[in-house]
């Protein structure tokens, strides 16, 4: 009996036309939502003038439906048993699942000012930037609508730069009508234990953002894993959002709509400093902000963001070192709300429920030559927003799953 089930599973999880896996893989049958909480800065003037702690108040959720578009350019390669594809991006605002509208205003760090002062370290260039910042009446902080902040706005300071620069700024700009990839993943035809594992991303096996093993593209995209998952496994996956591969470890057995699943979580060790977790040495890219690689819980992804000083963390700086959150008031990290988990059905390796949580932060540093940053006495890793991307298998799909997979085994 078990052998027959294994044979059936192996056949059905292959990523090729006609299998259950392929149908759900091309276009997810699960509704995926991305909730945003924006960190509204309460004391912009005090920060700018006196280098005070930044007082933030989170506002949200603002919810978008995402990942509703089918994979594009799906191409099988029989020679190396891979399938390549693009994952299109799309987001639709869901007013009924949100606390307000896309027109709601927030006081946030001025993204362009913080980024430009970081990218252009030359003092003379900073003086040029300063005159443009003043001319455009820009400051260290700005008021922006949710729509502008997420999806883009024309920045008045960058619009004055007399040579060609992108004048549109947004945390997720450009998003709609763009695609992530090309991904090339193993289809599992020749070896089911490699199914969904990424072979190349954007035509490469490495990212070119990190040194050594940190630069590797490991595992799947976390939507599924090779079948027959064991609790002892460390599940590797790659997330383009954070420009790196990461891993999850087994935490507990969970019953999801009558389906036994394994809950895998991202452990605090994955965010530790190289002092605590030597494997993380290559995620420490500079010595000053990281306090000689002793800070933890924040990931500098500037190399992946055209030099813009973007730092990724868990929401509310969960699992981050005290020095990171010390200059920020109003954060309340807790594991239940702020960690990432994957609920995996172990026989098929399918992720039936997940909550991917991350926080987008921007570094802002004092600058002698930029007036609005002149009074800062320290560096700040400023939280801009955090997001919770969730998906849960629908009731209908769960019934089908129970009858066709778990029911057969039990």
């Amino acid at each position: 009996g078990d052998l027959l089930i294994q044979k059936t599973i192996k056949k059905q999880v292959v990523l090729e036309e006609g299998t259950i896996a392929f149908k759900n893989w091309v276009k997810t049958g699960t509704e995926v939502y991305r909730q945003f909480w924006i960190f509204d800065v309460q004391n912009p003037q005090e920060v700018m003038m006196n280098s005070s702690n930044i007082q933030v108040k989170q506002r949200g959720p603002y919810t978008y439906r995402v990942r509703f578009l089918a994979k594009e350019n799906v191409t099988q390669d029989a020679e190396d048993n891979t399938v390549s594809f693009l994952q299109p991006n799309g987001a639709i605002f869901e007013p009924s699942l949100s606390v307000g509208t896309e027109a709601d205003n927030f006081t946030v760090l001025n993204l362009a000012v913080a980024a430009a002062s970081h990218i252009y370290q030359n003092q003379f260039v900073q003086m040029i930037l300063n005159s443009l910042i003043n001319k455009s009446k820009s400051s260290m902080f700005q008021v922006r609508t949710l729509r502008e902040l997420l999806w883009g706005y024309r920045d008045p300071f960058l619009s004055l730069v007399p040579y060609p620069v992108t004048t549109t700024v947004g945390l997720f700009y450009p998003y709609n009508n763009t695609a992530d990839g090309v991904y090339k993943v193993f289809n599992g035809k020749d070896n089911i234990s490699k199914v969904a594992i990424i072979d190349t991303y954007k035509g490469k096996r490495n990212l070119s953002y990190w040194e050594s093993h940190c630069d590797m593209i490991n595992g799947t995209d976390a939507a599924s894993f090779p079948p027959f998952v064991e609790k002892s496994q460390v599940l590797q996956f790659f997330s383009s959002d954070i420009c790196r591969s990461i891993y999850a470890v087994f935490e507990s057995d969970v019953n999801l709509k009558g389906i036994p699943v394994y809950r895998f979580v991202l452990p605090s060790k994955a965010f530790a400093s190289p002092v605590e977790n030597p494997d993380n040495y290559c995620f420490c890219t500079e010595k000053i902000i990281s306090k000689n690689c002793t800070s933890y819980g924040v990931l500098d992804i500037s190399k992946c963001k055209e030099g813009r000083p973007v730092y990724i963390s868990l929401p509310h700086f969960l699992y981050a070192s005290p020095d990171v959150s010390e200059p920020i008031d109003g954060l309340n990290p807790n594991e239940e709300e702020h960690r990432t988990y994957l609920d995996i059905e172990p026989i098929t390796g399918f992720t039936l429920q997940f909550a991917k949580r991350l926080q987008v932060n921007l570094l802002v540093k004092p600058s002698e030559k930029i007036q609005v940053l002149k009074n800062l006495k320290r560096n700040y890793i400023v939280p801009i927003l955090w997001l919770n991307e969730t998906g849960t298998i629908g009731d209908e799909k769960a019934n089908m799953f129970r009858s066709q997979v778990t029911g057969k085994i039990n």
Partner: antibody, heavy 115, light 107 residues
Framework: EVQLVQSGAEVKKPGSSVKVSCKAS????????MQWVRQAPGQGLEWMGG????????AYAQKFQGRVTLTADKSTSTAYMELSSLRSEDTAVYYC????????WGQGTLVTVSS | ETTVTQSPAFMSATPGDKVTISCITS??????MNWYQQKPGEPPKLLIS???TLRPGVPSRFSSSGYGTDFTFTINNIESEDAAYYYC?????????FGQGTKLEIK
């Protein structure tokens, strides 16, 4: 050693243009911006503008805006200052000088504007 | 624009004297003041850069002080070779602006 060598003296007619060159050596040209300063006979120093060869960032003094053009050629480590619509008041020694603190200077180029 | 008012325009001293030159700026420029010496027929020479920093190779009899808007340049124990024009330059903001210059004559 750091050296800034400027082009030779020029005599120009009013209304014409002049282009002064400044060849840098002894350091990586794109590491530092090049500033331009002029000094009329018996007068003080006057900042005209500066260019950062790395980013192409340029700033001009308001007085010269629209009349001066600064360029930099990284391949030859040479900076240029072109001043157009010359008038007699533009008769001066023109200096290129490195960095914000003007730590090294060219020998100067005398531009005489006379009909 | 930050204007820089330099005084005096002219001063005379004898070897061994101490002289001071003042530069006052119209805006707060922190300590972003530089001082130059220029002799006839030569380009200016940087003596002291931002932060009252004496340049390598410049004799220690030259010094400067000041922060914000008031700056002072001092030559102790003057020597005959110090006869020159002296200029201050603010490098805090654009446009960069010079003082009008001080002519120092050695008797």
């Amino acid at each position: 050693e750091v050296q800034l060598v400027q082009s030779g003296a020029e005599v120009k007619k009013p209304g014409s243009s002049v282009k002064v060159s400044c060849k840098a050596s002894g350091y990586r040209f794109s590491d530092y911006e090049m500033q331009w300063v002029r000094q009329a006979p018996g007068q003080g120093l006057e900042w005209m503008g500066g260019i950062d060869p790395e980013t192409g960032g340029i700033a001009y003094a308001q007085k010269f805006q629209g009349r001066v053009t600064l360029t930099a050629d990284k391949s030859t480590s040479t900076a240029y200052m072109e001043l157009s619509s010359l008038r007699s008041e533009d008769t001066a020694v023109y200096y290129c000088t490195r960095k914000l603190d003007f730590d090294y200077w060219g020998q100067g180029t005398l531009v005489t504007v006379s009909s | 624009e930050t204007t820089v008012t330099q005084s005096p325009a002219f001063m005379s001293a004898t070897p061994g004297d101490k002289v001071t030159i003042s530069c006052i700026t119209s805006t707060d420029i922190d300590d972003d003041m530089n001082w130059y010496q220029q002799k006839p027929g030569e380009p200016p020479k940087l003596l002291i850069s931002e932060g009252n920093t004496l340049r390598p190779g410049v004799p220690s009899r030259f010094s400067s002080s000041g922060y914000g808007t008031d700056f002072t340049f001092t030559i102790n124990n003057i020597e005959s070779e110090d006869a020159a024009y002296y200029y201050c330059l603010q490098s805090d903001n654009l446009p960069l602006t010079f003082g009008q210059g001080t002519k120092l004559e050695i008797k």
